[in-house]
């Protein structure tokens, strides 16, 4: 029961999450015009990763894309990339995970697959929710680097008379949007992984029996072919998945429904 | 076509206060900021303040703050300029301004405050 | 707050002038985030309400005659009527639409000769 409600709920923690990413990644307000210098601006400026936008004194947004792929800065492509890499698997992840579900009955399918698609789906949105964050922080720490280079050289003189206040950008809503939904997705993610241990088939108790052999006093107790054959010594029962985060080989290595007779 | 109808003139006493109305009609009432501005005889125009209809945010003069309110009743398309403690200097023509790039003008209530 | 400065406050001249009013802000009106000045020019008629002709300090209002055209950045921008028709005899004015308060000039009344 336990389990189930750790899948259940690190599904629906990984959903918001990705959900979460999608909207951050489409959301607008990734740097917003700091109002600091300028509390009364009727032009605000906010850019995402896809357009930039400015809001009028009218209150009328007209927002331009960036028709360019070459001509925008490595960092915005590779926050985009990060961003876009972590929304993809975090739908294949959620996609798997709908299927590992144990509430949810596909077929004949075994505990061990549904094990296996647990920690994949787990795996999966623990590296989505990395990579928004990724995504997210770096284009924050591009923010503080490009304002804090606008503050040195804030104002410019204009034929001596003049100041010109130079545009800064401040962190804008997406980015938090952002690092809570990559936080989720994460959350999630360990959710399904720590869930995955549970769903594993767990060893059967086979107590230790001793065989006399005629003339001889020496027990002989299963347990000697572990990996091969799925008995164990053990009296207790014993989570196969003790790690949690085992790499998908190490995980076929373990025994199956199966292996069992 | 885009139109704004402002209420008639008014004539006030120093101290009193003026509501003035502007109707809009052939634009999304809530599309865009209802700006109004002030001209007296003879003198440059000048900005009083603005209403956002969608959240009923403003932003004032600090000229006006404390003076000047302005609201929106967005069922009936109609922005109100209330101007209290009217001195003779608050005599002039007022205009409500809309659309993208402040396009649109009212035709001006001429409010006169004379004792 | 951005104070409008506009010279001549008046001027006279003749139908088929080509005529040019300047228009100084105290400060810049350009805005990075779409590479737009944010000056505005007014014409009113006596008795009427101001009716926009250029926005962005350079671009014409719809139904606006090509005759009139906006120039300038920053700071310094100006306002010129190529041949001067008996309809533009009015008085222009000049707009600060990029921070509040909204502030504009002091007018410029342009009469026959």
């Known amino acids: 029961m336990a389990v189930t409600a750790c899948q259940g709920l690190g599904f629906v923690v990984s959903l918001i999450g990705i959900a979460g990413i999608i909207a951050a990644t489409c959301m607008d307000q990734w740097s917003t015009q700091d109002l600091y210098n300028n509390p009364v601006t009727a032009v605000f400026n906010y850019q995402g990763l896809w357009r930039s936008c400015v809001r009028e004194s009218s209150g009328f947004t007209e927002c331009r894309g960036y028709f360019t792929l070459l001509g925008l800065p490595a960092m915005l492509q590779a926050v985009r990339a990060l961003m876009i890499v972590g929304i993809v698997l975090g739908a294949i992840g959620l996609l798997v995970s709908i299927f590992a579900l144990k509430c949810i009955r596909i077929g004949s399918m075994e505990d061990s697959a549904k094990a296996n698609m647990t920690l994949t789906s787990g795996i999966m949105f623990i590296v989505s929710g990395l990579c928004a964050i990724a995504g997210v922080s770096v284009f924050a720490n591009m923010l503080v680097t490009n304002f804090w280079m606008s503050t040195a050289n804030m104002y410019t003189g204009m034929g001596g008379m003049v100041q010109t206040v130079q545009t800064r950008y401040t962190f804008g809503a997406a980015l938090f949007v952002g690092w809570v939904a990559g936080g989720l997705t994460l959350i999630g993610g360990v959710m399904m992984c720590i869930a995955c241990r549970g769903l594993a088939p767990e060893e059967t108790n086979y107590k230790a029996v001793s065989y006399h052999a005629s003339g001889h006093s020496v027990a002989y107790k299963p347990g000697g072919f572990k990996a091969s054959t799925g008995f164990g010594s053990n009296t207790k029962n014993k989570k196969i998945y003790d790690g949690g985060a085992r790499t998908e080989d190490e995980v076929q290595s373990y025994p199956s429904k199966h292996d069992y007779v | 076509q885009v139109q704004l109808v402002q209420s008639g003139a008014e004539v006030k006493k120093p101290g009193a206060s003026v509501k003035v109305s502007c109707k809009a009609s052939?634009?999304?009432?809530?599309?865009?900021?209802m700006h109004w501005v002030r001209q007296a005889p003879g003198q440059r125009l000048e900005w009083i303040g603005y209403?956002?209809?969608?959240?009923?945010?403003?932003s004032y003069n600090q000229k006006f703050k404390g003076r000047v309110t302005i609201t929106v009743d967005t069922s009936a398309s109609t922005a109100y300029m209330e101007l209290s403690s009217l001195r003779s200097e608050d005599t002039a023509v007022y205009y409500c301004v809309t659309t993208r790039y402040l396009a649109v003008w009212g035709q001006g209530t001429t409010v006169t405050v004379s004792s | 707050d951005i104070q409008m400065t506009q010279s001549p406050s008046s001027l006279s001249a003749s139908v088929g002038d080509r005529v040019t009013i300047t228009c100084r802000s105290s400060q810049s009106l350009f805005n990075s985030g779409n590479q737009k000045n944010y000056l505005t020019w007014y014409q009113q008629k006596p008795g009427k309400a101001p009716k926009l002709l250029i926005y962005w300090a350079s671009t014409r209002e719809s139904g606006v005659p090509s005759r009139f055209s906006g120039s300038g950045s920053g700071t310094d921008f100006t306002l010129t009527i190529s041949s001067l028709q008996p309809e533009d005899f009015a008085t222009y004015y000049c707009q600060n639409d990029y921070s509040y308060p909204l502030t504009f000039g002091g007018g410029t009344k342009l009469e026959i000769k």
């Open positions: 209403i956002n209809p969608n959240n009923g945010g403003t």
């Open positions: 052939g634009y999304t009432f809530t599309d865009y900021n």
